[in-house]
Interface confidence: medium
């Protein structure tokens, strides 16, 4: 289908092509600022809450050209963030805790097979 | 839990408290730029593809203070975007189509009951 778009381009308004190009650019696979629910990220006990409940980090997101590709991180850094942890029933007031969050620093569209290999090589390590 | 936070501030470095505040700010419920998969958004036929497969629009996202609240749009505009539509098997080349996408312009943390009411009032209309 990539080939056919080359031919299609020849007959369409430059304005249309520019706006389509812009959409590709904005939706490409790259690190994007997202809100992560702290409790869900770490699977904490249901009686433990965090304030704020979410943190802002970068994770790979966006779209790949093809159905068989997936937007995956190729490098990761870790960010330490301090939050209040509240345990119910309240035996003590909220205590500040410092938690490390994965922050994706680069991304790539990878075939689902490569993703599978990458995940399994990490597990084997 | 809000009450208990009154006592949390005691004796903590201002820096810790300010960084926690900054996290609240960055993760608040607000319109955020997201990538929308066009096919999934409109539930199109499996033999229809779009190039680019995704578009960038604003949708409400982020976190609310409480479990019972949900980040919901309170106002919406519609953006027209031109994409190439490709139908398989290729009876013709990619054709440009203009599609309207919901773009959230303001958001609010609403109780799940309010969300239910809002959705149902829209359905009744």
């Amino acid at each position: 289908t990539e080939e056919t778009i080359k031919f299609a381009a020849a007959h369409y308004n430059t304005e249309i092509l520019k706006s389509i190009d812009n959409e590709w650019r904005k939706t490409q696979c790259m690190p994007r600022e997202v809100c992560i629910d702290v409790g869900k990220e770490f699977g904490v006990a249901t009686n433990t809450f965090f304030k704020p409940p979410c943190v802002s980090v970068y994770r790979c997101g966006g779209c790949c050209n093809s159905e068989g590709l997936q937007c995956m991180n190729t490098s990761t850094s870790y960010l330490s963030k301090t939050l209040f942890e509240i345990t119910v029933p309240l035996s003590q007031g909220p205590k500040p805790v410092t938690i490390s969050f994965a922050n994706h620093t680069s991304c790539r569209c990878m075939s689902k097979l490569d993703v599978y290999r990458q995940v399994h090589s990490i597990i084997r390590r | 839990t809000e009450e208990t936070i009154k006592f949390a501030a005691a004796h903590y470095n201002t820096e810790i408290l300010k960084s926690i505040d900054n996290e609240w700010r960055k993760t608040q419920c607000m319109p955020r730029e997201v990538c929308i998969d066009v096919g999934k958004e409109f539930g199109v036929a499996t033999n229809t593809f779009f190039k680019p497969p995704c578009v960038s629009v604003y949708r409400c996202g982020g976190c609310c203070n409480s479990e019972g609240l949900q980040c919901m749009n309170t106002s919406t505009s519609y953006l027209s975007k031109t994409l190439f539509e490709i139908t398989v098997p290729l009876s013709q080349g990619p054709k440009p189509v203009t599609i309207s996408f919901a773009n959230h312009t303001s958001c609010r943390c609403m109780s799940k009951l309010d969300v239910y009411r809002q959705v149902h009032s829209i359905i009744r209309r």
Partner: antibody, heavy 122, light 107 residues
Framework: EVQLVESGGGLVQPGGSLRLSCAAS????????IHWVRQAPGKGLEWVGF????????YYADSVKGRFTISADTSKNTAYLQMNSLRAEDTAVYYC???????????????WGQGTLVTVSS | DIQMTQSPSSLSASVGDRVTITCRAS??????VAWYQQKPGKAPKLLIY???FLYSGVPSRFSGSGSGTDFTLTISSLQPEDFATYYC?????????FGQGTKVEIK
Amino acid sequence: EVQLVESGGGLVQPGGSLRLSCAASGFTFTYSWIHWVRQAPGKGLEWVGFISPGVGYSYYADSVKGRFTISADTSKNTAYLQMNSLRAEDTAVYYCARDADYDYAGWAFDYWGQGTLVTVSS
Amino acid sequence: DIQMTQSPSSLSASVGDRVTITCRASQDVSTAVAWYQQKPGKAPKLLIYSASFLYSGVPSRFSGSGSGTDFTLTISSLQPEDFATYYCQQTYRIPYTFGQGTKVEIK
């Protein structure tokens, strides 16, 4: 333009209550810190407490803990100081002040209200 | 709580004089110190934040220095409008605390 305007001061009897308001404009109230500071006649500045309106936590000086409550209504961009069980020594001009933003290079009270006088006397 | 001790509590000076006010914290507060000027019947005004940074719109004759526990506010050449009371404040830990003030009077 950033502005803080206090209101609600006046004469009250010992043991009585009073609620002061601090109306804010010209900045993002929700993610600021709003402090209350008082000054007894002819004396220095005394920090009373603060609230982080968007986050919902507040903290108080020992001298007012349990008697004063700071709250905020983010829909009205207003902070409140509810003063109960007032004593003669609470007589002062009460100021609200904004703590400089997190993104700012340092923390200090960059904007203050004009102050409102609270007199506790029988 | 962190105590802030200011000295002197008052001083007399003439226009054009160099004036120095010191403030000592009861424990290390890094550079989280602010200085304010207050005139009778008015709200305080921020002069210096983070120990040494001049707040916008404040004349350059005002300067601040110090870190840890010892801090100084200096007015290089006193002007008629500078006669006022000056306060230091630590913003390192909650509760924030002020010094007791230094009154600068005309000699």
